[in-house]
């Protein structure tokens, strides 16, 4: 797995620790928590990523309406179970034995239940709503530059291809950025959808998680971005499945 | 303006190695990748590879892992391809450019010649 | 790869008249309603330079008697009224798949 050879760090991960006992003396690097090694020339997957975190210490409508299927993050951090390419495993549990589905992002698609809950597969999470609100401007971006610059980020940055960055949707103060990834695209070697989004929003709180990097410094035609509110809404290729308590909750 | 300043034209033996380099102005140089494009007249246009200015590694099609080798210097903002064990079939206009919102290649440099002759 | 088949290799067209060229893909080369396939112009001793990007728009800069159609695999670069100026070799090129890939090319001349 590659890295920065000079000086043996992960550019795309700082939660690993890297030495030089590779094949060849080649620098490896492990992620914190799971001690899975990983390639530092493209992103670290969540699963490992949220692992590593819960180990470290403690610190005119053009706009799209998220469907009635549409996930958000709610149950916050965990420390998840996951498999040995570092996808997150269908079933949860925490250590009182209460246990859920997740989608291939993390995210709780099921009631809690105990030991005996099922989880027959990892359902994927092929769409994701990335809402943003930024501060207040002199005025409203340009939205062909808004998307260009987007795009340029998440190729760049995360290496996500642009034909994953379904739309860049504009209504000042809101951007929507749409990243649709179905199986039957993604190619081995592809970012997922899921991994970048996730860079991107820990980017956006200012939690980087490339080693040695500032902050992201958006500009829009050298205009600041930046963003005051950020809400994910995720669509799994099936739709979850919830009690009708919580949905009338 | 957003400038790619190529270096120029190369006339070389076959077998040696040849470096030919692009500097980049008019833009913050990490923000984009630097891609080189191989034209000659048997095969039109082809992709060659990209260098990452932002991790620094690079990324070659199949036909030209051994053939390149590409580096970057932030420090003069500056991307060098390295030919090498040079045949006549390396002869060709070889070009910089830098990629747009959709991957097309809306930055060009000048083109730099190489003409391998013995 | 994805190969594009450019046709015809050259053209020759009267000034003032339409002149067509036609890019054929392997597979497809749409996403979410983005055709990822750009047209460039490109005169002696100068690099290529973007005409059309997304199948359909219109580079900043670029005259609108160029105009670009198609979806999926048959894409089509469009002159018309044919200029002088225009005399120049057209590429086609697909960015939905790693490697980029380019057409062969079409020589364009004034009759």
């Known amino acids: 797995h590659t890295a920065a050879q000079d000086n043996c760090t992960c550019p795309t991960n700082k939660m690993t620790v890297c030495s030089p006992d590779g094949p060849g003396g080649r620098c490896q690097c492990r992620a914190l928590g799971s001690g899975m090694a990983v390639d530092c020339s493209t992103l670290t997957s969540k699963c490992l990523l949220l692992k590593a975190r819960m180990s470290a210490p403690k610190n005119a409508r053009t706009l799209v309406r998220p469907s009635e299927h549409a996930l958000v993050d709610n149950d916050g951090l965990y420390d998840p179970d996951c498999d040995p390419e570092g996808r997150f495993k269908a079933r949860q549990c925490n250590q009182t034995s209460v246990c859920w589905c997740v989608n291939s992002v993390g995210v709780r698609r099921t009631d809690k239940g105990d030991l005996s809950l099922r989880c027959d597969e990892l359902v994927r999470t092929h769409h994701i709503l990335i809402d943003l609100r930024h501060r207040p401007t002199a005025g409203a971006f340009n939205h062909s530059d808004l998307d260009a610059e987007l795009r340029r980020l998440f190729r760049e940055r995360y290496r996500l291809h642009p034909k994953f960055v379904a739309a860049v949707h504009y209504e000042q103060p809101t951007i929507q950025i749409e990243l649709r990834q179905n199986t039957s695209q993604k190619a081995a070697g592809d970012v997922d959808i899921g991994d970048a989004a996730y860079y991107f929003e820990r980017d956006i709180k200012g939690e980087s998680l490339f080693q040695g990097r500032g902050g992201l410094d958006l500009r829009v035609r050298g205009e600041p971005l930046q963003v005051e509110r950020t809400l994910i809404y995720y669509l799994d290729e099936i739709p979850p499945k919830f009690s009708m308590k919580r949905l009338t909750a | 303006q957003v400038q790619l300043q190529q270096s120029g034209a190369e006339l070389v033996r076959p077998g040696v190695s040849v470096k030919i380099s692009c500097k980049g102005s008019?833009?913050?140089?990490?923000?984009?990748?630097i891609h080189w494009v191989k034209q000659s007249h048997a095969k039109s246009l082809e992709w060659i590879g990209l260098i990452s200015t932002y991790y620094g590694d690079a990324t070659y099609t199949q036909k030209f892992k051994g053939k390149a080798t590409m580096t970057v210097d932030k420090s003069s903002s500056t991307a060098y391809m390295e030919l090498a064990r040079l045949t006549s079939e390396d002869s060709a206009i070889y070009y910089c450019?830098?990629?747009?919102?959709?991957?097309?290649?809306?930055?060009w440099g000048q083109g730099t010649t190489l003409t391998v002759s013995s | 790869d994805i190969v594009l088949t450019q046709s015809p290799a050259s053209l020759a067209v009267s000034l003032g008249q339409r002149a067509t060229i036609s890019c054929r893909a392997s597979?497809?080369?749409?996403?979410?309603?983005?055709?990822?396939m750009h047209w460039y112009q490109q005169k002696p001793g100068q690099p290529p330079k973007l005409l059309v990007y997304r199948a359909s728009n219109l580079e900043s800069g670029i005259p609108a008697r160029f105009s670009g159609s198609g979806s999926r695999t048959d894409f089509t670069l469009t002159i018309n009224p044919v200029e002088a100026d225009d005399i120049a070799t057209y590429y086609c090129?697909?960015?939905?798949?790693?490697?980029?890939?380019f057409g062969g090319g079409t020589k364009l001349e004034i009759k």
């Open positions: 090129q697909q960015s939905y798949e790693d490697p980029p890939t």
């Open positions: 008019g833009y913050t140089f990490t923000d984009y990748s």
């Open positions: 450019a830098l990629l747009g919102a959709y991957n097309y290649f809306d930055y």
């Open positions: 597979e497809s080369v749409d996403s979410y309603g983005n055709s990822f």
